[in-house]
Amino acid sequence: YDFTNCDFEKIKAAYLSTISKDLITYMSGTKSTEFNNTVSCSNRPHCLTEIQSLTFNPTAGCASLAKEMFAMKTKAALAIWCPGYSETQINATQAMKKRRKRKVTTNKCLEQVSQLQGLWRRFNRPLLKQQ
């Protein structure tokens, strides 16, 4: 999906009002210095591309974050403020339902959410290019 035509300011508002708080809640009890950020993003479409991938793609040691509150709110924000996003996600959602597992907060998931926090912070940088 090409995130170029999203309403970035509306997504930023959704992040600041709720998503950021849900990420902090998920990370509660973890020191902010515990994980090194190894990925970043260039402009807002890039940030959303990486946020989407990191939030919804299973990775080694962290099978799924998709059912977490921050992920559901991220998905809703993208569906509302990115034209055509919902249609591209129908097949992906069906595949995700098939492989859904019991929620377990592993250290790898904490590390992944720490990376997500960094990507969202970069997305919100005032000087970051729209596209």
Epitope: V39, S42, E50, L54, L128, K129
Partner: antibody, heavy 117, light 108 residues
């Protein structure tokens, strides 16, 4: 520390597909960062080809996108480049590098690929 | 596509002298700029990122400055091992990251 090593044929015929592999040691490619390919034609500057991130997102240079595929094999801790329909203009030293998806902090030593019949 | 223009193409200096290399972007890249050093037959090495932050292990004689469209890499006092080609790279314009054409710093 992380080390990267490119391998693959040094000579490819025009119209064929160039295939290179980058073996990574000292760091798991599924643990963090992105893993990138960059090339440098003889005596010229650098050109970014694309990357695959540790969580599988892929990004390509738009000028090469139609011909490029980057993939990974986490069990072997390596990632690969395929460039199709090559011409003499694709003759270059090809580097693999570790990236934070912005800049490139560790590089392989590079491998020269010549496109010639 | 953002074009990076480096100047001069070649800089002839003696060890101990100060080197000032320029990189100009065709449009603003904020501080999203890196500098690399490349010696003959070797891969590039990251020197500076975010326009002014030194990469791990890079000596303090290397410094970067600038923002927007005009950037400078300064080597305060050239050591023999500093004679090489230097490239700038912008990462403001994903997915079109681009490099400058390079500046060669040679021994006078």
């Amino acid at each position: 520390q992380v080390q990267l090593q490119e391998s693959g044929p040094g000579l490819v015929k025009p119209s064929e597909t160039l295939s290179l592999t980058c073996a990574v040691s000292g760091y798991s490619i599924s643990s963090g960062y992105g893993w990138s390919w960059i090339r440098q034609p003889p005596g010229k500057g650098l050109e970014w080809i694309g990357y695959i991130s540790y969580y599988g997102s892929i990004s390509y240079n738009p000028s090469l996108k139609s011909r490029v595929t980057i993939s990974r094999d986490t069990s072997k801790n390596q990632f690969s480049l395929k460039l199709s329909s090559v011409t003499a203009a694709d003759t270059a030293v090809y580097y693999c590098a570790r990236t934070n998806l912005l800049y490139f902090d560790s590089w392989g030593q590079g491998t020269l690929v010549t496109v010639s019949s | 596509e953002i074009v990076l223009t480096q100047s001069p193409a070649t800089l002839s200096l003696s060890p101990g002298e100060r080197a000032t290399l320029s990189c100009r972007a065709s449009q603003s890249v904020s501080n999203n700029l890196a500098w690399y050093q490349q010696k003959p037959g070797q891969a590039p090495r990251l020197l500076i990122y975010d326009a002014s932050s030194r990469a791990t292990g890079i000596p303090a004689r290397f410094s970067g400055s600038g923002s927007g469209t005009d950037f400078t890499l300064t080597i305060s006092s050239l050591e023999p091992e500093d004679f090489a080609v230097y490239y700038c790279q912008q990462y403001s314009d994903w997915p079109q990251y681009t490099f400058g054409q390079g500046t060669k710093v040679e021994i006078k």
